[in-house]
C-alpha cells in the first residue's frame, strides 16, 4: 500500500514539475526590465526564450520571436537546449512511468517489470529536473553577469548634459516557476525510485522442510518461488488524474491596427 | 466615432475643490488608459495624471500629487479628476485623452477651463 | 524628469516650402527593446486640442498627409513638413512618451508670412 501511494505520488509530482518546466520554457518573462531606477516607467521590456516583448503604460504589447539561430549568444542556445531535453525526458518518463504504476493492470506484467519501468522513469524525471534547475540557473547566472556590466556603465554621459540610460534586466517570473518545477520533477523521481525499491521481488528461498508421510520418506525441497504471479496483487480501483499545462500568452493589442511580430 | 466630452469646469476659489468629468463614448472604455492633461499660456502643455484601464496603476504629477485624485467608471464610460487645495496655478484648460499605441495620445477632448481666483 | 527643448519657438514660413523643426530631449528615448523611439509629434490649431500627428517618431497616425515625417533617434528629433499648406498653421509640439512624468515641449509656432 505505502509503495502504491509513494509511486502515484511521485507520479503526480513529476507530472506537476513537467507540466511547470513547459510552462517555464513557453513563458516571456525570463528576464524582466529592473525598475530600479526608474519605478515609472511608461515601457517595459520582458524577455524568454523564444522572443522579446515590450509592454507600453497604454496596454499595447509587441513580441518579437528571435528569427535567428546563429545570431543568438551560446548560453541561450544551451537553456534552450538543456530545457527542452527536460521536457523530452520527463515526457518520456511519464509515459513510462504510467505503464508501471501499481494500480494500473496492463496483461500479466510482472511486477519486476513494474519495478524496472519505475526505476527508469524514476532516473528520467530526476534527470529532467536536473536539466531544467540548470538550464534555469546557467540563465540566472547570464543574467547576474550582464546585471552588474549594465550597473558599471549605467550612466554614458552624452555631451555632459544628456544621458543615456542603458536597460538592465533581473530575473522574471519564470525562472522561479523553472526552479520548482525543476525541484518538483526531481523529487517526484526520486519518490519513484524509492517506490521502485518496494515493488521489486525479493528473491524468498524456504528452508528445506521434510514431510513424513506414513510408509513413505519424502522430502519436498521447493525452490525459491517468484513472490508474486503479477495477478490479483490489487485489485483496489484507484483514479489516476492526468494534469496539463497550459500556458497562456496575455498579449493586450488593440483592436482595427497593424499586427507586430 | 471616438468622443471625449469633458465638464466640471468653472471658477473656483484657492483652497477649494472641484470635480472634472469625461464622458467618452464611441470606443471601448475599458480598454484603454486615459490621462488628464492640462494646458495653460504660460506653461504650455502639462500632463496631469493617468489611469490605467483596469484603474490600476495610476500615477500623478508632483505638481499635483497628493491634491488631485483620477478614477474612472467602466461601466458608465466616465473619467473623473477630483481636485483638493487648489492653488491659481493650477488655472488652466483640462483635456482628457485617450491613450494609445507609443504612449501617445490619439483623440483629446475639447476641454473644460477651471479658474482658480479670489 | 525628461526635459524636452523645442527650436526654433516660431517658425516663418511661404506656402509650398519645406520646414524643419527640432526637438532634443534630455535623456535617450530609444527603447532598446523593439529599437523605437518613444517621441510623439502633436498639431494644435487654435482653439482646437492638439491633434496626433507622428508617434515612434516617425510612425504617421492614420490619416495624417504624407507630408508630415518625422525623424531621429536618442536625443534629437526633426519634424519635417514638405510643401507647407496654408491648414499646416499651428503649434506644433513634441512629447516624451518613455518614461513618467510624460512632458511635452515648449511648442514651435508655425506662421505664414
Known amino acids: 500500500m505505502a509503495v502504491t501511494a509513494c509511486q502515484g505520488l511521485g507520479f503526480v509530482v513529476s507530472l506537476i514539475g513537467i507540466a511547470g518546466i513547459i510552462a517555464a520554457t513557453c513563458m516571456d518573462q525570463w528576464s524582466t526590465q529592473d525598475l530600479y531606477n526608474n519605478p515609472v516607467t511608461a515601457v517595459f521590456n520582458y524577455q524568454g526564450l523564444w522572443r522579446s516583448c515590450v509592454r507600453e503604460s497604454s496596454g499595447f504589447t509587441e513580441c518579437r520571436g528571435y528569427f535567428t539561430l546563429l545570431g543568438l549568444p551560446a548560453m541561450l542556445q544551451a537553456v534552450r537546449a538543456l530545457m527542452i531535453v527536460g521536457i523530452v525526458l520527463g515526457a518520456i518518463g511519464l509515459l513510462v512511468s504510467i505503464f508501471a504504476l501499481k494500480c494500473i493492470r496492463i496483461g500479466s506484467m510482472e511486477d519486476s517489470a513494474k519495478a524496472n519501468m519505475t526505476l527508469t522513469s524514476g532516473i528520467m524525471f530526476i534527470v529532467s529536473g536536473l536539466c531544467a534547475i540548470a538550464g534555469v540557473s546557467v540563465f540566472a547566472n547570464m543574467l547576474v553577469t550582464n546585471f552588474w556590466m549594465s550597473t558599471a556603465n549605467m550612466y554614458t554621459g552624452m555631451g555632459g548634459m544628456v544621458q543615456t540610460v542603458q536597460t538592465r534586466y533581473t530575473f522574471g517570473a519564470a525562472l522561479f516557476v523553472g526552479w520548482v518545477a525543476g525541484g518538483l520533477t526531481l523529487i517526484g523521481g526520486v519518490m519513484m525510485c524509492i517506490a521502485c525499491r518496494g515493488l521489486a521481488p525479493e528473491e524468498t528461498n524456504y528452508k528445506a522442510v521434510s514431510y513424513h508421510a506414513s510408509g513413505h520418506s519424502v522430502a519436498y525441497k521447493p525452490g525459491g518461488f517468484k513472490a508474486s504471479t503479477g495477478f490479483g496483487s490489487n485489485t483496489k480501483n484507484k483514479k489516476i488524474y492526468d494534469g496539463g499545462a497550459r500556458t497562456e500568452d496575455e498579449v493586450q493589442s488593440y483592436p482595427s491596427k497593424h499586427d507586430y511580430v | 466615432d471616438v468622443q471625449l466630452v469633458e465638464s466640471g469646469g468653472g471658477l473656483v476659489q484657492p483652497g477649494g475643490s472641484r470635480k472634472l468629468s469625461c464622458a467618452a463614448s464611441?470606443?471601448?472604455?475599458?480598454?484603454?488608459?486615459m490621462h488628464w492633461i492640462r494646458q495653460t499660456p504660460e506653461k504650455g502643455l502639462e500632463w496631469v495624471a493617468y489611469v490605467s484601464s483596469g484603474s490600476r496603476p495610476i500615477y500623478y504629477a508632483d505638481t499635483v500629487k497628493g491634491r488631485f485624485t483620477i478614477s474612472r467608471d467602466n461601466p458608465k464610460n466616465t473619467l473623473f479628476l477630483q481636485m483638493t487645495s487648489l492653488r491659481s496655478e493650477d488655472t488652466a484648460m483640462y483635456f482628457c485623452?485617450?491613450?494609445?499605441?507609443?504612449?501617445?495620445?490619439?483623440?483629446w477632448g475639447q476641454g473644460t477651463l477651471v479658474t482658480v481666483s479670489a | 524628469d525628461i526635459v524636452m527643448t523645442q527650436s526654433p519657438s516660431f517658425l516663418t514660413v511661404t506656402a509650398g516650402e519645406k520646414v524643419t523643426m527640432s526637438c532634443k530631449s534630455s535623456?535617450?528615448?530609444?527603447?532598446?527593446?523593439?529599437?523605437?523611439?518613444?517621441l510623439t509629434w502633436y498639431q494644435q490649431k487654435p482653439g482646437q486640442p492638439p491633434k496626433l500627428l507622428i508617434y515612434w517618431a516617425s510612425t504617421r497616425e492614420s490619416g495624417v498627409p504624407d507630408r508630415f515625417t518625422g525623424s531621429g533617434s536618442g536625443t534629437d528629433f526633426t519634424l519635417t513638413i514638405n510643401n507647407v499648406q496654408a491648414e499646416d498653421l499651428a503649434l506644433y509640439y513634441c512629447?516624451?512618451?518613455?518614461?513618467?512624468?510624460?512632458?511635452f515641449g515648449a511648442g514651435t509656432k508655425l506662421e505664414l508670412t
Open positions: 535623456q535617450s528615448l530609444l527603447n532598446s527593446g523593439n529599437q523605437k523611439n518613444y
Open positions: 485623452a485617450r491613450f494609445y499605441y507609443g504612449n501617445s495620445f490619439d483623440h
Open positions: 512629447q516624451n512618451a518613455y518614461s513618467f512624468p510624460l512632458t
Open positions: 464611441g470606443f471601448t472604455f475599458s480598454g484603454f488608459g
